[in-house]
Interface confidence: low
């Protein structure tokens, strides 16, 4: 007869490992007992369990509660055992010794491989600001056995660098994603993808990019200067900008205080019925935690009577 086993048994951390050992004998042969031991190189054999045809299963104290026979029905020639809740320390060489009658003893070895799936972590880099050079956006670390693969999935343009640290029974892989921050990256996902033979599917951790910036400011409302005449109601100036974090707006007048009746409402400056007092240089000041911008415009309130007088002069001059 002969023993049937596997060269390598692979399980994921925490799963049950079936250690196969089946005696394929001739008709009439019987298995008296099966002894399982751990036999790592350089260390003495450590008994796991003994399966006796008459007395049943005996588990050594070191493995008490962790070694069982497979559930019934059982073939009397099957000496396989289950190692419950495999841990990383279980990885190594195992041997089964089968005592048969009348053929004698047989032995076979297998290697137990315990996969330790990674628990990845993503750490965002320092605050991203538009205008910075190449900056760390995020780093992703995953430790497992064997070493996991760490990659990035994103539409954002950037560069990656990886490094690995080997430990006694595992390896930690860290990948960094660097980019040149721009406002278009705001809200874009940066996903760390971790692959490992112990995972049914890739693990993904998504970080949303947040880039501080402040756009140039501009003022709208003076497109048609002829509308800015004495008596006009509802005149307003609107300050245009965008930023992250969202900016705040402040209005001042360069050549004196804001005239009475002028209302400041965030990005908008509202005027009462226009008078010549409203002529002047107005400044919109936009700021956020990242930066500040100014935009100034000159308001020149026209007097229709003066204008009509000028037109008459021009006509008479021609």
């Amino acid at each position: 007869g002969e023993l049937e086993t596997s060269d390598v048994v692979t399980v994921v951390l925490g799963q049950d490992a079936k250690l196969p050992c089946f005696y394929r004998g001739d008709s009439g042969e019987q298995v008296g007992q099966v002894a399982w031991a751990r036999v790592d190189a350089g260390e003495g054999a450590q008994e796991l369990a003994l399966l006796h045809s008459k007395y049943g299963l005996h588990v050594s104290p070191a493995y008490e509660g962790r070694v069982e026979q497979p559930p019934p029905p059982r073939n009397p020639l099957d000496g396989s055992v289950l190692l419950r809740n495999a841990v990383q320390a279980d990885e190594g060489e195992y041997e089964c010794r089968v005592s048969t009658f009348p053929a004698g003893s047989f032995q076979a070895r297998l290697r137990l491989r315990v996969l330790v799936p990674p628990l990845p972590s993503l750490n965002p880099g320092p605050a991203l600001e538009e205008g910075q050079g190449l900056t760390l956006a995020a780093s992703c670390t995953a430790e497992g056995s064997p070493a996991p693969s760490v990659t990035w999935d994103t539409e954002v343009k950037g560069t990656t660098s990886s490094r690995s640290f080997k430990h006694s029974r595992s390896a930690a892989v860290t990948s960094e994603f660097h980019l040149v921050p721009s406002r278009s990256m705001n809200g874009q996902p940066l996903t760390c993808v971790v692959s490992h033979p112990g995972l049914l599917q890739d693990q993904r951790i998504t970080h949303i990019l947040h880039v501080s910036f402040l756009a140039e400011a501009s003022v709208r409302g003076l497109e048609d200067q002829n509308l800015w005449h004495i008596g006009r109601e509802g005149a307003m100036l609107k300050c245009l900008s965008e930023g992250q974090p969202p900016p705040s707006y402040n209005w001042t007048r360069l050549d004196g205080p804001l005239p009475s009746g002028v209302r400041v409402d965030g990005d908008t400056l509202g005027f009462p019925p226009l008078t010549t007092e409203h002529s002047g240089i107005y400044v919109c000041h936009v700021s956020n935690e990242f930066s500040s911008r100014d935009s100034q415009v000159t308001v020149d309130v026209l007097d229709p009577q003066e204008d009509s007088g000028k037109q008459v002069d021009l006509v008479s001059a021609s």
Partner: antibody, heavy 125, light 107 residues
Framework: EVQLLESGGGLVQPGGSLRLSCAAS????????MSWVRQAPGKGLEWVSA???????YYADSVKGRFTISRDNSKNTLYLQMNSLRAEDTAVYYC???????????????????WGQGTTVTVSS | DIQMTQSPSSLSASVGDRVTITCRAS??????LNWYQQKPGKAPKLLIY???SLQSGVPSRFSGSGSGTDFTLTISSLQPEDFATYYC?????????FGQGTRLEIK
């Protein structure tokens, strides 16, 4: 006026398919990220799927492989193709817009600031 | 996935009361936290974005605070129209997740 209007809901048997549509108006649709969020009867809100302005798509585990989100920027319309429907997919489905005052950046930071009125999907035999 | 836990699940209060609802994330989400109000038969409405920023058109009696894992929505003086269900939602990473909701009822 900024508006989202869902359609396409109805009664369907388990294993069947439906396609939801969401017509957007009043804003530059192509600049914004959009999501579908659902609410089962008497239950809380559950995010279903998102699509970025660039076309990247994301799904909740509960619908991955069964639902497909897409957009047609020329028609200002968001879609949700729902296949292999189950009883637990029964819900009101809302179309939502991500973004604050400017849709050109910071999709997630602002949360979902515009919601449709919802369309009801009932999966039952 | 990031889990969001709201407390309390329901709350009874009177008009004029100061009300606080809390939301806890299972991991740090910086300030990527939004609050919504939903009335029966209606779509949710965004109240607060980025943990503490008041959405345009929302009354100033609503305020938000917090960062990292712990967040708070406060209504300084409850009005009759504020009785509704309130949800928090993280926008730090996909899948986007909501709290289970807090139902605010009239005492």
């Amino acid at each position: 006026e900024v508006q989202l209007l869902e359609s396409g809901g109805g009664l369907v048997q388990p294993g069947g398919s439906l396609r939801l549509s969401c017509a957007a108006s009043g804003f530059t649709f192509s600049s914004y990220a959009m999501s579908w969020v659902r609410q089962a009867p008497g239950k809380g809100l559950e995010w279903v799927s998102a699509i970025y302005s660039g076309g990247s798509t994301y799904y909740a585990d509960s619908v991955k492989g069964r639902f497909t989100i897409s957009r047609d920027n020329s028609k200002n319309t968001l879609y949700l193709q729902m296949n292999s429907l189950r009883a637990e997919d029964t819900a009101v489905y809302y179309c939502t817009r991500h973004g604050g005052d400017s849709g050109s950046w910071s999709y997630y930071y602002y949360g979902m600031d515009v919601w449709g009125q919802g369309t009801t999907v009932t999966v039952s035999s | 996935d990031i889990q969001m836990t709201q407390s309390p699940s329901s709350l009874s209060a009177s008009v004029g009361d100061r009300v606080t609802i809390t939301c806890r994330a299972s991991q740090s989400i910086s300030s990527y936290l939004n609050w919504y109000q939903q009335k029966p038969g209606k779509a949710p409405k965004l109240l607060i974005y980025a943990a503490s920023s008041l959405q345009s058109g929302v009354p100033s009696r609503f305020s938000g605070s917090g960062s990292g894992t712990d967040f708070t929505l406060t209504i300084s003086s409850l009005q009759p129209e504020d009785f509704a269900t309130y949800y928090c939602q993280q926008s730090y990473s996909t899948p986007l997740t909501f709290g289970q909701g807090t139902r605010l009822e009239i005492k």
